[in-house]
């Protein structure tokens, strides 16, 4: 049959392992051919057993609380047939209690806040524990509270959890303090499991500090190159009060120059100096002025504390600052008219040394191959200027300090090249024209029109005519559209193919410019065979295509 | 009934390589741990590692690991200890041991042991 | 250099009672059960005492395990002459993730 004793596993064992007893057969003589087996919630995960000897360990910590009583049950085979040796049975484990549940605080984190030198007695904070364990069980859920830290500012009601101020605090020397609550069970008897809490208890500021300097004297530089806006220093008050008490606001008592400001950076209490107007290190290399400090909130009570404003005094010393060669116009227009030749005065820019040593400045000017310039700014031109190739030219004129190449200021220079009558006006496209054999005379063969490369002030005007020896004995007139076209019209009835398959008729064409420029264009008219309806049918003749001559006279 | 037979004595130079194997019976082989302990002459016993024939996993000694690889043949239930860059100081008796479900329950088989000697 | 420390050697008269002690430490002992092993020259141990102070059948019951905090003492009563031999105490380190032995206390039977 089987042996064994009643099973107990104290709760809460903290060993990875406890054993808790040995189940076994009577039949078993030792020789290992039995292998023990346990069923039942529990098994193999709370309870194992050794298959070999029958021990049963307790692998993890049990809880009474959570679960009294284990119900499993046991199993021995021999090994060597397979068969059980006893008949399954039932067993009990029981899970004995034991304080094992500490006093909680359930409501922590406890915060509370008092006004500092509050009077002895007053009410600070409840803190109230409870306790898991059953309260019917002796003393395991009576508790006593007492006070673990934070004597002798406060003390606690053991019985309550009350805990009032036993001695007036100043924020200044301490802001907040730490409170330790202690509960124990078992009204604090041997064998008292305990729990503690930690109570901050904060106290809240009056404002009885006014913001002092921390400095008498600030020394502060600031760059004759920074722009207006930048901040060159912070100044920075301390006021042992806090939070809305602690705000201060900055401020110029005075300034004669009217040159910097102060803010305030509320995050950090700082008084930020700011540069209000340039300052030129030439004009006036160093300022004297006086801030004040006060808080922002000041209770009316309290006034006392806050008559007189801290102040300051900040001198501020200007760095000199090797400042670039400045121009005298922010950019420069010239004009000049075009076939101007070589060596031409454009124009004369002008840059100066801004700083007291006064550098001679040299002149250049970046990448152009047209224009010079001399160390007197004087611009010329190194050729003649073709307007209708550029009309606008885009300079970077350089000025360089002599005594310091790296100081270096550039400002575009706009060069316009004025128009001369330069340019013939000439046929705005080539022009390929046809006449038919059966052509009746006034007939319109073709319509021309030119265009002339120079600018026009008013608008271009155009005159067409036949050269001379065209019109002497022509087979083809012009006339003039006044309009800046002409029409070709046919001067004869009858055209021979044969005899004459091309004409060239030379038309001059003169602009309104002053003086006039006239050009002579070659129109080519090519004798087609047409049908009576007068629509090309063949047009033979040797070349297909002719370019049009022309030249400016 | 339950025997774990090891394999004959071995002589080996430094720096070699020795494989000894393990064959069990009488139980299911991948039930239980299999430990290996070693014993050098005149010394005590010194744990070695563990390996478990279900899972092939292991855990060595922190001296040996490295240096020792444990496996297993589940088709011959045997299991082996190879112990590598040997040196003079590993001339000691090998065993292996049957241990129990849990990693803390102790050795109840042992088999007659390899005596391993290394020497030049 | 063992973890678990025991006495080298010890030696008792028939019919005598000699207890071997064993220290070790809280991961060691303080937190393990404790087993106790029987070497005889010449063979592999074989198990005397398992978890603190359990004998496994066939273990006669002179030989008795005990254990207090981060120590373990095997105690044989009415010492015989077949129980001199090599006693090891050995188990598990939670630090080590190990098997720990002691160095072993060699039992000479007197007489």
């Known amino acids: 049959g089987w042996v064994w004793n009643q099973f107990f596993v104290p709760e809460e064992m903290n060993t990875t392992s406890h054993h808790v007893g040995r189940l076994r057969s009577d039949l078993d003589n030792g020789n290992n051919s039995f292998q023990y087996k346990l069923l039942g919630a529990g098994a193999g995960s709370t309870f194992i057993i050794d298959e070999r000897t029958g021990d049963i360990y307790a692998i993890e910590k049990l809880d009474r609380e959570e679960r009294s009583l284990y119900i499993l049950r046991a199993q021995v085979i021999d090994i060597t047939t397979g068969r059980a040796v006893e008949p399954e049975s039932e067993f009990v484990i029981k899970v004995s209690d034991i304080n094992d549940n500490e006093p909680k605080f359930l409501d922590e984190p406890y915060e509370a806040i008092v006004p500092e030198m509050s009077p002895e007695g007053t009410l600070v904070i409840q803190v109230t524990a409870s306790d898991a364990d059953d309260p019917s069980s002796g003393n395991n859920a009576r508790l006593l509270y007492s006070l673990l830290q934070g004597q002798p500012y406060f003390s606690v009601e053991p019985t309550t959890g009350v805990i009032r101020i036993s001695s007036k605090m100043d924020r200044e020397l301490q802001d907040e303090y730490w409170v330790i609550i202690q509960a124990k069970d078992m009204i604090g008897q041997p064998g008292a499991l305990s729990g503690t809490t930690s109570v901050l208890i904060k106290l809240s500021d009056v404002n009885d500090n006014k913001p002092i300097f921390k400095e008498s004297l600030y020394r502060l530089t600031v760059s004759e190159s920074a722009p207006t806006g930048t901040s060159i220093g912070t100044i920075m008050a301390y006021d042992n009060d806090i939070g809305e008490n602690a705000e201060m606001d900055y401020s110029i008592e005075e300034d004669d120059s009217q040159t910097f400001d102060i803010i305030t950076n509320h995050e950090t209490q700082e008084g930020i100096v700011i540069l209000k107007k340039k300052v030129n290190f030439e004009h006036q290399n160093h300022y004297g002025i006086r801030a004040k400090v006060k808080n922002h909130h000041v209770d009316k009570q309290l006034m006392k504390y806050h008559t007189e404003a801290s102040t300051t005094f900040i001198k501020i010393q200007v760095e000199d600052v090797d400042e670039p060669p400045l121009f005298l116009l922010p950019y420069y227009i010239f004009e000049i008219f075009e076939e101007t030749p070589q060596g031409s005065f454009v124009g004369v820019v002008s840059a100066t040394d801004p700083d007291n040593r006064k550098s001679p400045i040299r002149y250049s000017i970046t990448r152009s191959k047209v224009f010079n310039i001399d160390d007197n700014g004087t611009i010329t031109t190194t050729n003649s200027l073709d307007r209708e190739i550029s009309a606008w030219y885009n300079l970077s004129i350089t000025a360089t300090e002599k005594y310091n190449i790296e100081q270096i200021s550039s400002i575009p220079v706009y060069v316009q090249v004025l128009n001369i009558n330069d340019h013939a006006p000439e046929f705005s496209q080539y022009y390929e024209s046809y006449v038919c054999e059966n052509a009746g005379s006034g007939q319109v063969i073709q319509t021309i029109s030119a265009v002339d490369r120079d600018e026009s002030i008013e608008e271009h005007h155009f005159y067409f005519n036949l050269s001379v020896e065209d019109t002497n004995s022509s087979s083809f007139t012009i006339i003039d559209n006044q309009d800046n076209t002409a029409v070709i019209l046919t001067n004869r009835t009858g055209f021979n193919l044969q005899e004459e398959p091309i004409f060239y008729i030379s038309i001059l064409i003169a602009d309104n410019g002053i003086p006039s420029l006239t050009s002579t264009n070659t129109l080519t008219i090519h004798v087609c065979d047409c049908d009576d309806s007068g629509s090309t049918q063949t047009c033979q003749y040797q070349e297909l295509m002719l370019s049009m001559g022309f030249k400016t006279e | 009934q339950v025997q774990l037979v090891q394999s004959g004595a071995e002589v080996k130079k430094p720096g070699a390589s020795v494989k000894v194997s393990c064959k069990v019976s009488?139980?299911?082989?991948?039930?239980?741990?299999i430990h290996w302990v070693r014993q050098a002459p005149g010394q005590g016993l010194e744990w070695m590692g563990i390996?478990?024939?279900?899972?092939?996993?292991?855990s060595y000694a922190q001296k040996f690991q490295g240096r020792v690889t444990m496996t297993r043949d589940t088709s011959t239930s045997t299991v082996f200890m190879e112990l590598s860059s040997l040196r003079s100081e590993d001339t000691a008796v090998y065993y292996c041991a049957r241990g129990g479900i849990q990693l803390w329950l102790h050795f109840d088989y042992w088999g007659q042991g390899t005596l391993v000697t290394v020497s030049s | 250099q063992s973890a678990l420390t025991q006495p080298p050697s010890a030696t008792g008269t028939p019919g005598q009672r000699v207890t071997i002690s064993c220290s070790g430490s809280?991961?060691?002992?303080?937190?393990?059960?404790v087993n106790w092993y029987k070497q005889l020259p010449g063979t592999a141990p074989k198990v005397l005492i398992y978890?603190?102070?359990q004998r496994p059948s066939g273990v006669p019951d002179r030989f008795s395990g005990s254990k207090s905090g981060t120590s373990a003492s095997l105690a044989i009563s009415g010492l015989q002459s077949e129980d001199e031999s090599d006693y090891y105490c050995?188990?598990?380190?939670?630090?080590?993730?190990?098997?720990?032995f002691g160095g072993g206390t060699k039992l000479t039977v007197l007489g």
């Open positions: 809280s991961s060691n002992i303080g937190s393990n059960f």
């Open positions: 390996i478990n024939p279900i899972s092939v996993s292991t």
């Open positions: 978890t603190n102070n």
């Open positions: 050995a188990t598990w380190d939670d630090s080590l993730n190990g098997w720990v």
């Open positions: 009488g139980y299911t082989f991948t039930s239980y741990f």
